[in-house]
């Protein structure tokens, strides 16, 4: 789960929108029901004829997929309405880096001892941002309305509780899990923040706000300098509204544009080799904004073979401005007074 | 109660586009497939595509499929379906009506009073 | 596409008679078979869903069977209210089609 990990995870979204693995019944390692395939689903609402272009990863096979923006991915397993025709499916390898995973709450102590606050707006990245802006490692969602903050001694002592525990839908967000009764969701407070300096020798860096979409008039800055003589990234997901949502990849040393890409102009889909140590990812959104966003994974890379593409000329990186600085959250009846 | 108000009668040339709209109320209209359905004088009902007003996600007949269009205006909690390169043959009444929640989508359980689109030159 | 036929094409009975439709499907298509009623001028209206379950408040005297091409649609004791068109429309698979529809007239 952790932002420092993304080799382990097989998705990038909060939902699993972009899950595209082969577990094919509702609980992980033969466990749950059988998943029924997609192209024998027409009686329901959703089948490989509802996704021509492949756009959702439907098919002729019976894997776990979500197709409609739901929470997490599913499955169908019963071919008529009689009952539960469908199910969750448990996937273990599906969450995002960045997401820790789904704790107990008791309440006394609280798994999350820094300050907290409710909301019947949450999303998980509302809970982000005023975690961040309190200056805490750690933010947890409980209840689909309550948000936690704290910091990794914290979950040294915490008790994992199933995935599926963490239930329930953000009263923000019909697409998004916000923990459950008793039980916190906790994320790393860098998942969607507007800047950041990346050092560790792999990572995933997010669009700012993200899982949310990201906003209107985001200028945004993350510098990467990972141990190695160059480095590799690979866009898990790129979701920009139009090509006035601009994300610029320059030498850090040189200043100069290595590569740019847009809501016109995606990434490749493979991996793409740079041959700098250091570099600046700049992101801006236009006065419209509002898209998905992108994820994508970093490595160092031992050797500097560039991916042969010549750079784009030069320009000067504005500072980032500084994140969460509008964030509200309503205190939490009976909470300690925010730190 | 739940409802579906179409919009009035329309009359269009030939090679002219019709869109033809449905206010839902009294349920979540995000939540409840939409469909659309026409039936020409004297003939049997002929399905033409749906729409899942939460996300957006369409299903067309292929014998429509190069010419409707079908949208929804989620904060208007409306359904719209466009028909475009009229012909006379498009002379129909064409009904909204609500098909099943979420990934169930099993019947036409509410239907609007229908419209009537003529095509005549 | 799923062809759908309805036998007869009209019919005419007595108040109080027993009334059978028949709905043909080109291919097996399960249960998954809904009936409609339509009334002149006005929209259709569902009486029975995936072949035999009545929609709610419909009266009991409308009824369903069959299952994969062959299916009854049957009305124990017509009366002047159910003078319609009735149309039987599969969901097994895209595009959802109808029948022809029987026109039910009484004598």
């Known amino acids: 789960g952790s932002l420092h990990s993304p080799g382990l995870s097989e998705c990038f979204q909060v939902n699993g929108a972009d899950y595209r693995g082969h577990q094919n019944r509702t609980g992980p390692r033969g466990a749950g029901r059988p998943c029924l395939f997609w192209d024998q689903t027409q009686q329901h609402s959703y089948s490989s004829a509802s996704d021509p272009h492949g756009r959702w990863g439907l098919g002729a096979h019976n894997f776990c997929r979500n197709p409609d923006g739901d929470v997490q991915p599913w499955c169908y397993v019963a071919e008529t309405e009689e009952g539960i025709y469908w199910r969750y499916c448990d996937i273990p390898s599906c969450h995002m880096p960045g997401y820790l995973g789904c704790f107990v709450d008791s309440g006394a102590p609280p798994a999350l001892s820094g300050p907290s606050g409710t909301s019947t707006k949450l999303t998980v990245q509302v809970c982000l941002r005023f975690c961040r802006m309190k200056g805490y490692q750690l933010a947890g969602v409980e209840a689909g309305y309550a948000c936690f903050c704290g910091s990794e001694s914290d979950l040294a002592r915490g008790r994992l509780a199933p995935a599926t525990d963490c239930d329930q839908i953000c009263f923000g967000h019909p697409g998004q899990l916000c923990g459950g009764d008793g039980r916190l969701g906790v994320y790393e407070v860098s998942v969607g923040s507007c800047q950041g300096n990346w050092t560790a020798p792999q990572g995933v860096i997010y669009s700012p706000d993200f899982p949310d979409e990201y906003g209107p008039d985001r200028n945004c800055s993350w510098a990467l300098g990972p141990p190695g003589a160059a480095l590799e990234l690979t866009f898990r997901l790129f979701e920009l509204a139009d090509p006035r949502d601009r994300l610029e990849l320059r030498d850090a040393a040189s200043g100069s544009l290595l590569r740019a890409f847009d809501g016109a102009r995606p990434p490749p889909s493979g991996p793409l080799r740079l041959g700098t140590a250091a570099l600046l990812l700049t992101f801006r959104s236009d006065a419209r904004g509002h898209a998905q966003g992108f994820a994508l994974t970093y490595r160092g890379l031992q050797d500097a073979a560039e991916d042969p593409e010549a750079p784009e000329g030069s320009a000067q990186t504005p500072a980032a401005p500084l994140d969460g600085a509008n964030v509200s959250c309503s205190p939490r009846p009976g909470a300690p007074p925010a730190a | 109660q739940v409802q579906l108000v179409q919009s009035g009668a329309e009359v269009k040339k030939p090679g002219a586009s019709v869109k033809v709209s449905c206010k839902a109320s009294?349920?979540?209209?995000?939540?409840?497939?939409m469909h659309w359905v026409r039936q020409a004088p004297g003939q049997r009902l002929e399905w033409m595509g749906n729409?899942?007003?939460?996300?957006?996600?369409?299903h067309y007949n292929e014998k429509f499929k190069s010419r409707v269009t079908i949208t929804r205006d989620t904060s208007a909690s409306t359904a719209y379906m466009e028909l475009s390169s009229l012909r006379s043959e498009d002379t129909a009444v064409y009904y909204c009506?609500?098909?099943?929640?979420?990934?169930?989508?099993?019947?036409?359980?509410?239907w609007g009073q229908g419209t009537t689109v003529t095509v005549s030159s | 596409d799923i062809q759908m036929t309805q036998s007869p094409s009209s019919l005419s009975a007595s108040v109080g008679d027993r009334v059978t439709i028949t709905c043909r499907a080109s291919?097996?298509?399960?249960?998954?078979l809904n009936w409609y009623q339509q009334k002149p001028g006005k929209a259709p209206k569902l009486l029975i869903y995936?072949?035999?379950r009545l929609h709610s408040g419909v009266p009991s005297r409308f009824s369903g069977s069959g299952s994969g091409t062959d299916f009854t649609f049957t009305i124990s004791s017509l009366q002047p209210e159910d003078i319609a068109t009735y149309y039987c429309?599969?969901?097994?698979?895209?595009?959802?089609?109808f029948g022809g529809g029987t026109k039910v007239e009484i004598k």
């Open positions: 429309q599969q969901y097994s698979k895209l595009p959802r089609t």
């Open positions: 291919q097996d298509i399960s249960n998954y």
């Open positions: 729409i899942y007003p939460g996300s957006g996600i369409t």
């Open positions: 009506t609500r098909g099943g929640y979420g990934k169930g989508d099993w019947y036409f359980d509410v």
């Open positions: 995936y072949t035999s």
């Open positions: 009294g349920y979540t209209f995000t939540s409840y497939w």
